[in-house]
């Protein structure tokens, strides 16, 4: 008995195609190892027709492809466009040869059965609708017409003219003339299910003189669309389901052994599971939507379906286009953390995937919102200014090659907490979903900025420090400008031992930035960071108002945004070892579609992108970089 | 509450036949993979076969080793109902016939991912 189990028996229809499942054991060597598939001969020998090393004959050329799920311990041979020919023994297996592990598969392709020559044939999908035409001699004008369908003794009644309708077809099926034309009448049967597939005719008249005509109805369920996709990807489901159904709800679907549960309509429900990582995008007026899940999980592979219906949820005998998805676990995008967690006052330093290769890919980050059907408002990018209620506090410093940018979050408040995307306009498997979580501060911040109540004068010299505790004291520290194109790091010269200290003095730790002297351009925000190499870890924020000099003028309280920096200077809390355990942003790289697959955000990013420089690591905040200096004690 | 319903088992003699009905009425049928399977006195549950359709004109059919060649699988979609045409049948084929349905299309052998189970029909093969 072969440990490798399918399908003894398929059998299909000339055209159709055919999607043939081969199980096989759960072993390392049996993941691995070449799957094929072949066709018995009378000699005994099977001759291989595809094998997942690549392999592809010339009669399968274009229309055959055969996938191996190690995670499911099953590989795939999906045929097309299937002839007559097709039919015959074959074998699914596993081995470099074709003598290893194998299983018999018989498969027959029939002709679509023969129908009566005058035989009209209808082919319609599951939920659409059918007229059937039924043409009439003039002589048979004032008689009774009808529609039947035939059972296996009789054909049974379905509507006549005479308003008698069957019950199982009441409310949608109509029989109806169009205009003046005394030598056709119609039938509309709506909603269409499985069950109303079948030969029908159509009669006007009784008796021999009687006009009847044969109808086939097909009615058929779409075929379901293989999508193969990479762990932590992303996928957009673009559902068409026609004009008819334009102003009905729309929803998305999964299979699960019973029902198919709803994991997105239009009518608000969304999935606990794919919280911060679904939309759904009405595209236009003639039913079109799409639904995009960025961050995909093994567990979210599966049977999808969309839909439209009043009440949001699958009903028979309506519109629906399905899709198979498969997760492939072996995924070009690297495994990062997925939550990231900050404290209130604090800072999170997100780390953002995109692929290498496109380096100058416009990077943005946008803050995922799940009211009505979910949108994702950009925030900041490299060509979008910084949103105004982020003023002071948001900025993306990309690093080009290194396949990631960062985007830097400080003076946490717990509001701030919810799911963030990583996107760029280059290749939207690389959209990543972040959640964002922030707690109440407990201890004392790692960076502190004093003096705090920071107003300098016009044409006077203004020093800022900013303490840091030894933890940091191997690590670059930084103080930059912030605008909204971003936080451009300010030139600076390292008068501090950077040597390894055998001890280390808490107190004098720090690090100062001085205006010399204070012009009116330097008003504004200022960062205080620290990073080693490119990864940037904890910052701290500091409004600097500006003011002339008056005489016996007091300092005069920097404005509200400021109020809000002591705050967070006086609360914000991180663990020990900078942000490499709770603090560093390391997304899950919960990749996306591309920026018309989802409008929010692609028509927002074109909202935002500014003509203006987008802030980089090594910008200049200003031309005359000699007024400041960093000095490290 | 959705229901399938078994019926057509009985008593018959080693080497005679049977065909089992499940009819599942308030089934979106079409979605289905639909599957039998049987359980003796003191034994567990085993699969026996399973009819997957993919709304058009392909059917892929199931079958266990013990029950290959012996037995055929068919389903009436217009009636919602499936089929399983037992031949040759031996004494050790007495059991509890079950129908079950699903909408996962994993492996079809497993129980558990069945959702849907009938009462079950008796069938006895005397020697």
């Known amino acids: 008995k072969s440990p490798i189990f399918g399908p003894q028996e398929v059998s299909s229809i000339e055209g159709d195609s055919v999607s043939i499942t081969c199980y096989y054991p759960d072993t390392s060597v049996n993941r691995h190892t070449r799957k094929y598939w072949c066709r018995q001969g009378a000699s005994g020998m099977c001759t291989t027709l595809i094998s997942s090393n690549g392999y592809l004959s010339k009669e399968y050329s274009g229309r055959a492809n055969l996938i191996n799920f190690p995670e499911n311990n099953t590989f795939v041979i999906n045929i097309e466009q299937l002839t007559q020919d097709d039919t015959g023994s074959y074998k699914c297996g596993l081995g470099t040869s074709n003598r290893g592990l194998s299983f018999d598969v018989s498969l027959e392709v029939s002709q679509v059965p023969e129908l009566p020559s005058d035989t009209h044939v209808y082919t319609k999908d599951i939920g659409r609708n059918v007229t059937i035409e039924c043409p009439f001699k003039r002589e048979n004008a004032p008689s009774k017409k009808s529609l039947c369908k035939k059972t296996n003794q009789s054909c049974e009644l379905v509507i006549d003219s005479t308003e008698k309708v069957n019950p199982s077809y009441i409310g949608r099926a109509k029989l109806f003339m169009k205009g003046t034309d005394l030598t056709v009448f119609y039938v509309n049967i709506s909603h269409l299910t499985h069950n109303d597939a079948g030969l029908y005719i159509c009669q006007a008249g009784e008796g021999p003189s009687a006009d009847k005509k044969n109808v086939d109805l097909q009615v058929l369920a779409p075929e379901p669309e293989l999508l193969y996709k990479d762990l932590r990807s992303s996928v957009t489901f673009e559902c068409d389901l026609g004009r008819e159904v334009a102003n009905e709800a729309k929803y998305l679907c999964r299979m699960n052994k019973e029902t198919c549960d709803v994991i997105i309509n239009t009518l608000g429900k969304r999935d606990p599971d794919f919280e911060g990582r679904i939309l759904i995008t009405p595209k236009d007026d003639n039913g079109r939507f799409s639904v995009l899940i960025t961050g995909l999980r093994k567990e979210d592979a599966g049977h999808y379906q969309c839909g439209a219906h009043s009440s949001g949820l699958p009903q028979e005998g309506w519109p629906i286009q399905t899709w198979q998805l498969f997760v492939n676990e072996e995924s070009t995008i690297p495994n990062r953390r997925s939550v990231v967690k900050g404290v209130t006052g604090g800072s999170v330093a997100i780390a953002c995937p995109y692929n290498p290769k496109e380096s100058s890919s416009l990077k943005y980050w946008c803050r995922w919102e799940g009211d009505g059907n979910g949108h994702c408002p950009v925030l900041v990018g490299t060509q979008a200014q910084v949103q105004e209620e982020y003023e002071g506090r948001l900025a993306l410093f990309d690093q080009p090659g290194n396949g990631t940018y960062t985007v830097i979050l400080n003076q946490l408040t717990t509001e701030d907490a919810g799911f963030y995307w990583c996107l760029t306009n280059g290749d939207s498997r690389w959209r990543t979903t972040i959640e964002l979580q922030v707690a109440e501060a407990t201890r004392e911040p790692n960076l502190e900025v004093t003096p705090q109540n920071a107003t300098a004068v016009l044409g006077e010299t203004f020093t800022v420090s900013c303490h840091y505790p030894c933890k940091f004291y191997s690590q670059e520290k930084y103080w930059c400008k912030w605008s909204n194109k971003g936080c451009h790091i300010l030139p600076s010269h390292d008068e501090g031992a950077r040597q390894s200290s055998v001890s280390c003095d808490q107190s004098s730790q720090l690090v100062s930035m001085t205006l010399n002297p204070v012009s009116k351009e330097d008003e504004g925000w200022y960062w205080c960071g620290v990073k080693q190499g490119q990864t940037y870890g904890e910052t701290t924020a500091i409004y600097i108002a500006v003011e002339e000099r008056t005489r016996g003028s007091s300092h005069v309280n920097p404005t509200d945004a400021n109020a809000r920096a002591k705050v967070a200077l006086e609360e914000e809390v991180v663990d020990s070892s900078i942000s490499e355990k709770e603090n560093k942003a390391i997304p899950n790289p919960g990749p996306f579609a591309n920026e018309r697959e989802i409008q929010n955000v692609g028509d927002q990013a074109q909202e935002n992108r500014a003509s203006g420089d987008a802030g980089s690591a090594d910008g200049q905040s200003r031309s005359s970089s000699s007024k400041h200096h960093h000095h490290h004690h | 509450e959705v229901q399938v319903v078994e019926s057509g088992g009985g008593l018959v003699q080693a080497g005679g036949s049977l065909k089992l009905a499940c009819a599942a009425p308030?089934?979106?049928?079409?979605?289905?993979?639909m599957g039998w399977f049987r359980q003796a006195p003191g034994q567990e549950r085993e699969f026996v076969a399973a009819?997957?359709?993919?709304?058009?004109?392909?059917?892929?059919?199931y079958y266990a080793d013990s029950v290959k060649g012996r037995s055929t699988i068919s389903r009436d979609n217009a009636k919602n109902t499936v089929y399983l045409q037992m031949n040759s049948l031996k004494p050790e084929d007495t059991a509890v016939y079950y129908c079950?349905?699903?909408?996962?299309?994993?492996?079809?052998?497993?129980?558990?991912?069945?959702?849907?189970w009938g009462q079950g029909t008796q069938v006895t093969v005397s020697s």
């Open positions: 308030g089934l979106t049928f079409s979605s289905y993979r």
């Open positions: 009819i997957d359709w993919n709304g058009r004109g392909t059917y892929y059919r």
């Open positions: 079950a349905a699903t909408t996962v299309l994993t492996d079809p052998r497993v129980l558990n991912e069945y959702a849907t």
